[in-house]
């Protein structure tokens, strides 16, 4: 699909280029073009210019507002990469490293463990956790990953949860859990990821990540 889009874009660009060249040739009075063709092309071009000039004043008026609007409604997005930690805490650690995203100061990674947003609204929040476990080496309980929310003035709550049973592969079997959903976040709200056994989490490139996007 992308390849077809690219071809389409290039085709349109080529047509625009040919049109501009034709206007240029009309202006220089090249004999290879009929007068009728030139008149038609010129009036088409004048129409475009007239539209542009008419819209110019409106655009001028709107422009300052559009700029403000752009400033006031910036994209808010974050994507952070897992970080191996010596801490025994069940909350996963993250870092701004590798191919990460931190759009602006309206979202921050705090204490390496939680993404905190400064603007209220609907957010798509996701986490991918890859872990390597073995049925014999692990307890009977499944591996559980939880996406949690802490809002100002409110208790922590679990937003999403997923569980996988342990693999029989040796020394361990790799499995991935993906969590994702749309949630209302308040200013100052933080989201973080909890797992039952952080020692089983895989920190290789691309295996475990966490992020959000304001809709």
């Amino acid at each position: 699909h992308r390849r077809l889009d690219k071809i389409e874009d290039e085709r349109n660009l080529h047509e625009d280029f040919v049109f501009m060249k034709t206007i240029q040739r009309c202006n220089t009075g090249e004999r290879s073009l009929s007068l009728l063709n030139c008149e038609e092309i010129k009036s088409q071009f004048e129409g475009f210019v007239k539209d542009i000039m008419l819209n110019k004043e409106e655009t001028k008026k709107e422009n300052s507002f559009e700029m403000q609007k752009g400033d006031q409604n910036p994209q808010i997005a974050a994507h952070v990469i897992s970080e191996a930690s010596s801490k025994t805490t069940s909350v996963l650690q993250w870092a701004e490293k590798g191919y990460y995203t931190m759009s602006n100061n309206l979202v921050t990674l705090e204490n390496g463990k939680q993404l905190t947003v400064k603007r209220q609204g609907l957010y798509y929040i996701y986490a991918q956790v890859t872990f390597c476990s073995n049925r014999e080496a692990s307890s009977q309980a499944p591996f559980i990953a939880s996406l949690c929310l802490k809002s100002p003035g409110r208790f922590e709550r679990i937003l999403l949860r997923a569980a996988n049973t342990h693999s029989s592969a040796k020394p361990c079997g790799q499995q991935s859990i993906h969590l994702g959903g749309v949630f209302e976040l308040q200013p100052g709200a933080s989201v973080f990821v909890n797992v039952t056994d952080p020692s089983q989490v895989s920190h290789g490139t691309g295996f475990t990540s966490f992020g959000l996007l304001k809709l």
């Epitope: 403000q68 006031q72 100002p152 200013p187």
Partner: antibody, heavy 118, light 107 residues
Amino acid sequence: EVQLVESGGGLVQPGGSLRLSCAVSGFSSTNYHVHWVRQAPGKGLEWMGVIWGDGDTSYNSVLKSRFTISRDTSKNTVYLQMNSLRAEDTAVYYCARQLTHYYVLAAWGQGTLVTVSS
Amino acid sequence: DIQMTQSPSSLSASVGDRVTITCRASEDLYYNLAWYQRKPGKAPKLLIYDTYRLADGVPSRFSGSGSGTDYTLTISSLQPEDFASYYCQQYYKFPFTFGQGTKVEIK
């Protein structure tokens, strides 16, 4: 149509208690967050607290636990219980429904006047 | 708590005038600011939230702007029904706080 109607206001002596009601219609208090705001004579608006859709509550710490927000979902009514009332609690009390994804108050009641005086 | 300072506290204007009310916060609000209109004996009405978003049913002559600690409500052409009091509200941090209000009177 979304409507909020406060009642229960009136004259009360200092140290007394009062329970204000906010009857909501056109929406369910379990789906929306309902806030209480007051305005003392000649003063600005003061946010008091909120009961979230899931029943949790958050308060303005300035109010020192004298005020409690609760609700009766079967009656679709939210309450503000006010204890140990003082003269400075004299105000018009409003309940208001929050806009879905913002901490802003999109629909308000007309307010009920509470006068604390001996 | 975040302090909200609104100015002016009152102003006199004529129908058709452009009116600007400002609100200054004691810390960065990251655009978490709303404006309300209140007429005597009536419930407050939400005009603008998220600094510039117009609430449902609010005429386009009302607009909001600003960033950081400084925010503005503008009425491009004052109408007879706009004579009222206006309040700003921050919802960035608990407790949510309001400005002291600006009364717009007929000149």
